[in-house]
Interface confidence: low
Amino acid sequence: LPAQVAFTPYAPEPGSTCRLREYYDQTAQMCCSKCSPGQHAKVFCTKTSDTVCDSCEDSTYTQLWNWVPECLSCGSRCSSDQVETQACTREQNRICTCRPGWYCALSKQEGCRLCAPLRKCRPGFGVARPGTETSDVVCKPCAPGTFSNTTSSTDICRPHQICNVVAIPGNASMDAVCTSTSPTRSMAPGAVHLPQPVSTRSQHTQPTPEPSTAPSTSFLLPMGPSPPAEGSTGDFALPVGLIVGVTALGLLIIGVVNCVIMTQVKKKPLCLQREAKVPHLPADKARGTQGPEQQHLLITAPSSSSSSLESSASALDRRAPTRNQPQAPGVEASGAGEARASTGSSDSSPGGHGTQVNVTCIVNVCSSSDHSSQCSSQASSTMGDTDSSPSESPKDEQVPFSKEECAFRSQLETPETLLGSTEEKPLPLGVPDAGMKPS
C-alpha cells in the first residue's frame, strides 16, 4: 500500500521534523503550512485548521517561505543618482544601483546606499584603473610617448602617432602633429576606451590600462637601412622614402666633408663632449609625480648654418607647449654642454611590464663657423627597470663619448652595449618627440 500523504496540519512523529515549507506550531503542536513568498500568515494554524495566508500589501514583500504576521516594507524609492534594478514586488525588495558614470561609495546588503560620480582624468592623465560598480577611477600621468587630450573616466593614455616627419612633437596632453605625409599608428587614432584590446607588442598597450613609455619616432635622419617600427601598419611610399633618404644622405656627406676638411686644415674640431646619461631610473621613482611627465625637447648647440634639423633653441621652445608643472623626478635640467635623458614611467601597479628600453640617437650635422667646427653625436638611452628600487639608481652615471666619436655612427652600436641585456627590441633610431630640454 502506498504511504499515506499527511495533509497539514498534522502531528509529526516523535523526534521527526516537519516537511519542507512547513513549520511546527508549538501551540497546536502540529506541522502547519508556511506561507509562500509574497504572502504572510494572517491566521495561525490550530489542531484542526491550517495556516491562513494573505497576500502582502502594496510596498511590502516576503522573499522566503514564512509564517510572519506581516510582510516587510520595501526600501525607500531610489534617489536621483540611482537606477531601480529590481522593483518592489510582493516577493522581493526594491534594489537600487548606481546609474552609469557613478559608482557605489557606500554599499548595502543588496544594492547601494550612496552613489558618487566616477572621477574624470583630465588631459595629460589617463585611466590607470577603471571604475567599477564599487570603486572609483584611478588616474595616472601619461608617460613619455603617450598622451590623453580628453577629460574622461574611461580614456587611457594613448601612444603618440608615428610620423614620417614630425611637425609638432607630442606631449602628455597632445598627440604628435605630422607634416603632410600620412602618419602611421599602431592603433586606430580614435579615443581609446576601456576595456581595450591587446595591441602590438612594441606599444605595450594591454587591456589593463598600463601604457608603456614607447616613444613615437620621427624618421628625420634614417641611418642606414632601418626597418619600420615594429607594429606599425603602413608602408612609406617609395618616392617619399627616396626623397627623404637622398636629402638626408646629401646632408650627411656635406657634414662629413666639412669635418674632413677642417681636420686636414689642422683645425682640431671643437667636438663638444656631449654626454649621454643612461640613468637606470625605475618606474617607482616617478610614481609620486604631481603632474604628467614633461616632454623635454632636444636642442642642439646653435649653429650658423641651417639644416633640416631645428637648430634654434628659441624656435623649438616656441613650438613646444610649455607646461607649468614640476619637473618629473629623474629628469634633470641640463646645460647646453650635455644632454641628459631619463624616463619616469608612472606605473600605478607594481611590477609594470619589466624592463623597457628606449634608444634614441640624434645626429647633428657639423658646420663651419668662424673657423671653429661644432659637431656632436649625442646618444641618449633610457631604461626604466621596474624591478630595481630607487636607491639602486645611479645618481649621476655619465657615459662620455671620446672626441673621435663626434662623427655620427651608422648604428650607434647596439643598445645592448650601452645598457646591457634588454628584454625588448629597440625601436628604430631617430629623433624622439620627447627629447631634452635646456635649463
Epitope: 495561525f44 509564517w67 506581516e70 526600501g75 525588495n93 543588496e110
Partner: antibody, heavy 122, light 112 residues
Framework: QQQLEESGGDLVKPGASLTVTCTAS?????????MCWVRQAPGKGLEWIGC????????TYYANWAKGRFTISKTSSTTVTLEMTSLTAADTATYFC??????????????WGPGTLVTVSS | DIVMTQTPASVSVPVGGTVTIKCQAS??????LSWYQQKPGQPPKRLIY???TLASGVPSRFSGSGSGTEFTLTISDLECADAATYYC??????????????FGGGTEVVVK
C-alpha cells in the same frame, strides 16, 4: 556564546544628540534576525523603540512616539546603532539592545544586552 | 500602536502561593504574546512566548494562557527567587506597523 553589548551611553544636555551602539558576538546578523531597541526609564517599565531587519539594511520599524527623533542603523554585520536627537530629560533611561527573529515567531526577544545608561540633564 | 494593559501593578504573595497576572491587548494579537521577568539591575529574561510556550530553562511553575486580547501569566509554588517585575509584550510581528511590540506596564511581585 551569543551575546549583545551596548555602548555609548553618556550624560548629555537637553537638546543634544547621542548615538549608542549594539555589538553582537558569537553570531552575525542574518536573514533570521531583527535587532531591536528597548528602553527603560529609572523605576519605570519597558518601552519598545523600534527594530531593524539588518540583513537587507532595513526596513526599520518604530513605535509611533519614536518616529522622527530615533534612527536605527546597521553599521556592520555585527553592529547596529540607535541615534537619538533633540534629547530631553524624559529620554533618560537604560537602553537595551535585543535580538528578535524573522522566521520563527517563537523566538522573539530571546537575547538581550545588559543595557547602557543615557542621562539627559542640564 | 497597540496598547497593552497589565494588572495588577503590584502584588504581594507568600512563599508557596500562586500569583496571577493579567494582560489585555487593545486589539487581537492572536497568540503573539510573551512574558518576561526582570530583576533589578538586569535585562529582562523571557519566560513564555507564543502565549503559552515555556522558554528553555524556565521552571514549569510558570504557565501562560489566552489568545486574542486576553492573556494570563500564572506563577504557582512561589519562591523567593520569583520576586521580580513581570512584563507582557505583544510581539505580533516585529515588523509591526499594525501591531508593534508594545510592553505592558509591568507587575511587581513581592514574595512575603
Amino acid at each position: 556564546q551569543q551575546q549583545l553589548e551596548e555602548s555609548g551611553g553618556d550624560l548629555v544636555k537637553p537638546g543634544a544628540s547621542l548615538t549608542v551602539t549594539c555589538t553582537a558576538s558569537g553570531f552575525s546578523f542574518t536573514n533570521n534576525y531583527y535587532m531591536c531597541w528597548v528602553r527603560q526609564a529609572p523605576g519605570k517599565g519597558l518601552e519598545w523603540i523600534g527594530c531593524i531587519y539588518p540583513s537587507i539594511v532595513g526596513p526599520t520599524y518604530y513605535a509611533n512616539w519614536a518616529k522622527g527623533r530615533f534612527t536605527i542603523s546597521k553599521t556592520s554585520s555585527t553592529t547596529v546603532t540607535l541615534e537619538m536627537t533633540s534629547l530631553t530629560a524624559a529620554d533618560t533611561a537604560t537602553y537595551f539592545c535585543v535580538r528578535d527573529r524573522y522566521d520563527d515567531y517563537g523566538d522573539y526577544f530571546n537575547l538581550w544586552g545588559p543595557g547602557t545608561l543615557v542621562t539627559v540633564s542640564s | 500602536d497597540i496598547v497593552m494593559t497589565q494588572t495588577p501593578a503590584s502584588v504581594s504573595v507568600p512563599v508557596g502561593g500562586t500569583v496571577t497576572i493579567k494582560c489585555q491587548a487593545s486589539q487581537s494579537i492572536y497568540n503573539y504574546l510573551s512574558w518576561y521577568q526582570q530583576k533589578p539591575g538586569q535585562p529582562p529574561k523571557r519566560l513564555i512566548y507564543y502565549a503559552s510556550t515555556l522558554a528553555s530553562g524556565v521552571p514549569s511553575r510558570f504557565s501562560g494562557s489566552g489568545s486574542g486580547t486576553e492573556f494570563t501569566l500564572t506563577i504557582s509554588d512561589l519562591e523567593c527567587a520569583d520576586a521580580a517585575t513581570y512584563y507582557c509584550q505583544s510581539n505580533s510581528g516585529v515588523n509591526g506597523n499594525r501591531y508593534g511590540n508594545a510592553f505592558g506596564g509591568g507587575t511587581e511581585v513581592v514574595v512575603k
